[in-house]
Structure formats: C-alpha cells, structure tokens
C-alpha cells in the first residue's frame, strides 16, 4: 500500500473507560495532529477508517461494525461503544485517506472494571476547592455528546460508597455538586452516575473525581513563602555539611 503519515501510538491519550458503559472516542487526528477538522476532510473526499490491535496481540484487524444492537459504531469522527466489554481493550487506529493522501494515529484504550463502591484502576482527575470560601461547584465531567438535550437523564452523586442525599454542606443539583462551604472533611472521591434512555435501553455513565480541599489564596500564598524558605534552608544546610 502507498505511504501513510504514521503518527505512531499516541500514549498521551491513555483512554480509560468503564466496562459495560457507553464510550465515545474521537479520532485524535483532528484534535492533535491535523490542522483541519473532520467536516473539511469529509467534504474533500477523505474517508476515515478504524481498526484495532487486541491486547497482547500484534495483528491489526478491522473493527466489527456488524455486532448485535450496533454495539460498536462510527459516527463522523467518533467511535462509539454501546456499551464496552472488557475485551475491547487494545490499541485503536484511525486512518484518514483517499487515493493521494493518508494519515493515521493509534491510541490505547483500556476497559476497566469497577466495584460496587466505584473503586477501580481508573486515573482520577483532581478538583481543588478552597476551604470555607463560599459556594463552589463541581460538574459531572465528560458526559457531553452521549445524549441529546431533549433527553433528561437522572444523576446520582456519591461520596465514596454513599449516596449524597441530605441537606448538609454538599448538595447534588443535577449535573452539579454544590459545596455550600468546603470543609477538610469534604476531601475524598466523588462519583456521579448519569442514567439515560436510548432506543429502549438504559445506559449508565460513571465519572469519579477526587476533591482536594486546600487553603484559600491568601493562606496558599503564605504556604508558598514558607515552602520556599524551607527549601532555601534545606539547601543552605546541605551545602554546609
């Protein structure tokens, strides 16, 4: 086959998704590597092709888009799993080509399992809140594009294993979790579970993030000074012994 610009394995995008949940994965070519978007490419007669290499295998194979209930499908530059299975783990490649042009990139996809308390090998984003600062909100992340705005999902928030439902200082408000006043005791992992219907089926999206309650800007500024002084003292001490 003709030469193809191969961007290799994009390990910057370590995509992790939960087993038995929908996942939508955009082809990284248009996000990070090419200077044009999918619409432009499509209008210019370029075709986007997907294939994958299973975990612990070397053989590249086409993705089966003829599974029951369209479990895996492609829509524009997005690869959809409705839902994922554990053995979907592998390296996925999207290739953009026509007779005169070819560009491709691969990325790893890991399907991970979670327990009933949402513990998993998933790397968690950290959200900082300032202590006793007044109202602060966190938003259930990465759920855009899974359902149209006409669909009203139900959202349940958990701290660790426990559903948040009392009117304490942390209050679920749909896609937002509002901290009326952030306290050190609010440190921990927070999970939103978004449940929505699609074609007679019910899907769940689970998103967990770590909340870290930190000092205010003022106390943080003082902390930075103290830390700098500590480092300075440590280096001075070290050089004289």
């Amino acid at each position: 086959s003709e030469r193809c610009d191969d961007w290799g394995l994009d390990t910057m995008r370590q995509i992790q998704v939960f087993e038995d949940e929908p996942a939508r994965i955009k082809c990284p070519l248009f996000e990070h590597f090419l200077k044009f978007n999918y619409s432009t490419a499509h209008s210019a007669g370029l075709t986007l092709i997907w294939y994958w290499t299973r975990q612990d295998r070397d053989l590249e194979e086409p993705i089966n888009f003829r599974l029951p209930e369209n479990r895996i499908s492609k829509e524009k530059d997005v690869l959809w799993f409705r839902p994922t299975l554990l053995n979907d783990t592998g390296n996925y490649t999207c290739m953009l080509r026509n007779t005169t042009y070819c560009s491709k990139v691969a990325f790893p996809l890991e399907v991970v399992q979670k327990d009933s308390c949402f513990n998993s090998p998933m790397k968690l984003p950290v959200h900082k809140l300032y202590i006793e600062y007044g109202i602060q909100r966190i938003t259930c992340p990465n759920v855009d594009g899974y359902f149209p705005s006409s669909v009203k999902p139900t959202i349940t928030w958990y701290m660790g294993c426990y559903k948040i439902q009392n009117f304490n200082n942390v209050i679920p408000e749909g896609m937002n979790l509002s901290f009326l006043i952030a306290l050190i005791s609010n440190n921990g992992n927070y999970t939103c579970v978004v449940t929505y219907p699609e074609n007679g089926r019910t899907f769940h999206l689970t998103r967990t993030l770590t909340v870290k309650v930190v000092g205010s800007d003022i106390s943080r500024g003082l902390n930075d000074i103290f830390e700098a002084q500590k480092i300075e003292w440590h280096e001075h001490h070290h050089h004289h012994h």
Epitope: G134, S178, L180, I181
Partner: antibody, heavy 118, light 112 residues
Framework: QVQLVQSGAEVKKPGASVKVSCKAS????????MHWVRQAPGQGLEWMGI????????SYAQKFQGRVTMTRDTSTSTVYMELSSLRSEDTAVYYC???????????WGQGTLVTVSS | QSVLTQPPSVSAAPGQKVTISCSGS????????VSWYQQLPGTAPKLLIY???KRPSGIPDRFSGSKSGTSATLGITGLQTEDEADYYC????????????FGGGTKLTVLG
C-alpha cells in the same frame, strides 16, 4: 410542560393541623427538590423548608422546626406539607416550588390559601 | 424583618431603566449566588435571574442581574406597564443548617 398542582383552600381553627398537597408532572419527580414557601396577606415570601423527593430527606427553617413535616409519595409524584398547632399568624398562601438550592426556584405551584380563624 | 434588605418601592416611566438593590452580608449574598423573582398581582412568583446574572429561557434580556460584595442589583431596561409587580431577591445561608432567605420585596410602579 412542568406543572405543580396544589390542593384547595383550607379554613382551620387555632391549634389544628393542615396538610397541603402538591402534585408534580412534566418532569422526573426525583430529579429536583421541592421547597415550601408561604406568603401572609400583603407580606413578603417566607421559606419554610425543602424536601428531596429521591430519598425523602428534609431541611426545615428554624422557625418551623417541630411544627412542620414534609413528606412525599413517589408513586403519585406528590409532596405534602403538614403544619401543626396552627395560629392566626399562619394565615397565608402556601406555595410548593420546584428547584435546587443554589440556582433558584424555577417552577411554582398556584398556591393554597390557608385561613386560621376561630 | 428580612435578612436581605430591599427598598420597599421604586417607580419609573415606561421606556426608562430602573434598578432594585438587595443588601445582605458575607454569610449570605457575600459568599453565595443570588436569584430574583417577579410576582405579578395575584399570581405565584416567577424566576427572573439565577446565579447572580443568568436568565432562564423565556426571560427577556431587558432583565439583568449583578452582584458586588454583599449587595446584588436587578436591572430592568425599557420599562413596560406589565413589569409593574413585586420583586424579590433570594439567596441562602449555611451555618450547619441550610436556610433559604428572601428579601422583603420591592413594589415596582410604572408611572403613567
């Protein structure tokens, strides 16, 4: 469309209790909180409390603590507000209102007039 | 006696601009979001502004909200006769217990 339909007007004697109902439709009942707000004749709005229809948890204004009880029936998408030991100053229009805590109260019932008179 | 202080009344002619103030403290307005409601005579209140300055769908952009420190302001431009109503500000306070608080209300009269 979202609708909150409240029960009809009530006349009660001092010392009695009143139970006002509020039937919700047009949205997922358990996805929003329900507030109760009252308005005495010619006066402003006064918040009484809030209920989470999902789990049934409540938070009441200090002023009404011990006298008010908010409950819900998820099978009929209805919330209830019961106020006991009524006195003449409890004469007011009582509103149920859907909303969150930090982003406003977006839909209101039509109001229920409760008159307390001997 | 309301925790949030509003002027009892304001008035202006049609087409004019009017502002309604709402004064609180650091334990309510200062650290939290403010909502505004319009109550036409004989009807239930209606949400005009939430999160200090956001309008629900269907609310015209003649209505605006702002917040500075421990005070909030509702602005109405291009006054219309149907704007004659009572206006309430609202926020909350949390000191171990949640408490939603309303201002005492402001009666807006559209002159003429």
């Amino acid at each position: 469309q979202v609708q909150l339909v409240q029960s009809g007007a009530e006349v009660k004697k001092p010392g009695a209790s009143v139970k006002v109902s509020c039937k919700a439709s047009g949205y997922t009942f358990t996805s929003y909180y329900m507030h109760w707000v009252r308005q005495a004749p010619g006066q402003g709005l006064e918040w009484m409390g809030i209920i989470n229809p999902s789990g049934g948890s409540t938070s009441y204004a200090q002023k009404f603590q011990g006298r008010v009880t908010m409950t819900r029936d998820t099978s009929t998408s209805t919330v209830y507000m019961e106020l006991s030991s009524l006195r003449s100053e409890d004469t007011a229009v009582y509103y149920c209102a859907r909303g969150f805590v930090t982003s406003g109260i977006d839909y209101w019932g039509q109001g229920t007039l409760v008159t307390v008179s001997s | 006696q309301s925790v949030l202080t509003q002027p009892p009344s304001v008035s202006a002619a049609p087409g004019q601009k009017v502002t309604i103030s709402c004064s609180g403290s650091s334990s309510n307005i200062g650290n939290n979001y403010v909502s505004w409601y319009q109550q036409l005579p004989g009807t239930a209140p209606k949400l005009l502004i939430y999160d200090n300055n956001k309008r629900p769908s269907g609310i015209p952009d003649r209505f605006s909200g702002s917040k500075s420190g421990t005070s909030a302001t509702l602005g109405i431009t291009g006054l219309q006769t149907e704007d004659e109503a009572d206006y309430y500000c609202q926020t909350w306070t949390y000191t171990g217990r949640l408490w939603i608080v309303f201002g005492g209300g402001t009666k807006l009269t559209v002159l003429g």
